[in-house]
Amino acid sequence: PSGLVTANITDSEALARWQPAIATVDSYVISYTGEKVPEITRTVSGNTVEYALTDLEPATEYTLRIFAEKGPQKSSTITAKFTTDLDSPRDLTATEVQSETALLTWRPPRASVTGYLLVYESVDGTVKEVIVGPDTTSYSLADLSPSTHYTAKIQALNGPLRSNMIQTIFTTIGLLYPFPKDCSQAMLNGDTTSGLYTIYLNGDKAEALEVFCDMTSDGGGWIVFLRRKNGRENFYQNWKAYAAGFGDRREEFWLGLDNLNKITAQGQYELRVDLRDHGETAFAVYDKFSVGDAKTRYKLKVEGYSGTAGDSMAYHNGRSFSTFDKDTDSAITNCALSYKGAFWYRNCHRVNLMGRYGDNNHSQGVNWFHWKGHEHSIQFAEMKLRPSNFRNLEGRRKRA
């Protein structure tokens, strides 16, 4: 025979073809072998011109031989070489599908691989590719879009060889709150790490606000609106600064009275105050908390105390906010001026969390009277808020 070629090569099959011998022959003897693969020999009829090779090993170079037989006579042997394809990974599956994450798992191919190419594409045409190592059989997809159809494909790699792609289709779950109006809604969307988040006042995407969310204290979901921790930020600021907010949300900061008014106008909120000093901790929770608008000079409502710090905020309930340049307190003197801070002063304070950091002079420092009195400036303080019905929302989400 002559003109031995292989066609239709896959990872486990190939088709051998040849030109028949000019003379009539009884049979053809076909043999094929590969590295680490024992030789297989087959005899076929003399009028056959092709033979399907099956049960081949993937990604293997085979040597194929064929000769003709007529009675006791044998023709010369002709030879061809071919390499089987790399077989594909198997059983690609998307599990643990959330609004922005999913876990892809697969079974490895039979052939050894040098890695895998993962491609995932959303219906809007956004394509991402990632190459993972040869021992990997799962990959966590992140930063997906909620409520979106995705096609995920995987291909095995072995040097220059690439397997066929296999694919799976999945749909991310919709966010409970596409435009979370506070940290509790961000948490109910599945975000459980404390840090910076964007919230949308009244769920309006045009009213974006970057906030620090405390996702750990007492179940999480808190918007932190004040933090004192090291004295690097100046809190002896004017009315305009306290209305707008100032500082670094990751460090010491004040979120702003206008923002507090807008947030607490969204529903019923609770206040939590966390205090820390030389290894001691205390907290206060008030189940009703709101801040009025600029017309009321950001009047404070705080009721329903529980906790370990003592009820020092009650003294300030119903008071307007005061700064050194806008004196709204009930004292003849200017409390903000006298105590170098700003607060919902009365005459003057039980709480002075915006006082002078580290100042242990009477009433000048970061004070919470019923915990450390007025002659001890507290090292760490945070004020934070979340919806009063957060526990109910959280329970509903868990049941869902």
Epitope: D311, Y315, N317, R346, N347, H362
Partner: antibody, heavy 120, light 107 residues
Framework: QVQLVESGGGLVQPGRSLRLSCAAS????????MHWVRQAPGKGLEWVSG????????YYADSVKGRFTISRDNAKNSLYLQMNSLRAEDTALYYC?????????????WGQGTMVTVSS | DIQMTQSPASLPTPVGDRVTITCRAS??????LNWYQQKPGKAPKLLIY???NLETGVPSRFSGSGSGTDFTLTISSLQPEDFATYYC?????????FGQGTKVDIK
């Protein structure tokens, strides 16, 4: 309008007990802290004890600590002062007073008082 | 405990005169100071709280001032119905304490 009516005073021997009551009306009782203040005959005012609106926090003057107990029943709009181990120096007119807020702050509105006389 | 010292103990004053009563706290109390008026056989009545805030219904001739440790109650023009005993009281910390009283009587 706010009304506070004290009762339970009387003549009692030293070492004995007495329970004073204060019936409140005209305001949401559990929204306000309450106080007991006394005045010995011909003398000045002495703050005795106080209790927060919820009843969760109680406070006492050193002179009565360990002998007197303040309590309240918000369902009955009533304030109480249980006085044990009474002494002659506890003889006074006892006033109940409503605070301006839910915590120890300013005794704002006072009742007319009930007289306690400790004598053998 | 915080001691409250009032002066004078007695203040004979003619009707129409200005009256000034002072009160000193034994320690710093910000503005946590209140003034009461007591007439014979009657319960005390709150006049001023937070050192300077006039209680509802109290005539404007009464005023309070001061901060920290030193406080003053002023009656700008003494009226016949103002003859009474006046007490200062600190509400800064418990136990709350009263001054010993100042008796304003007719001169």
């Amino acid at each position: 309008q706010v009304q506070l009516v004290e009762s339970g005073g009387g003549l009692v021997q030293p070492g004995r007990s007495l329970r004073l009551s204060c019936a409140a009306s005209g305001f949401t009782f559990d929204d306000y802290a309450m106080h007991w203040v006394r005045q010995a005959p011909g003398k000045g005012l002495e703050w005795v004890s106080g209790i927060s609106g919820s009843g969760g926090s109680t406070y006492y003057a050193d002179s009565v600590k360990g002998r007197f107990t303040i309590s309240r029943d918000n369902a009955k709009n009533s304030l109480y002062l249980q006085m044990n181990s009474l002494r002659a120096e506890d003889t006074a007119l006892y006033y109940c007073a409503k605070d301006i807020s839910a915590v120890m702050d300013v005794p704002q509105t006072w009742g007319q008082g009930t007289m306690v006389t400790v004598s053998s | 405990d915080i001691q409250m010292t009032q002066s004078p103990a007695s203040l004979p004053t003619p009707v129409g005169d200005r009256v000034t009563i002072t009160c000193r706290a034994s320690q710093y109390i910000q503005g946590f100071l209140n003034w009461y008026q007591q007439k014979p056989g009657k319960a005390p009545k709150l006049l001023i709280y937070d050192a300077s805030n006039l209680e509802t219904g109290v005539p404007s001739r009464f005023s309070g001032s001061g901060s920290g440790t030193d406080f003053t109650l002023t009656i700008s023009s003494l009226q016949p119905e103002d003859f009474a005993t006046y007490y200062c009281q600190q509400s800064y910390s418990t136990p709350q304490t009263f001054g010993q009283g100042t008796k304003v009587d007719i001169k």
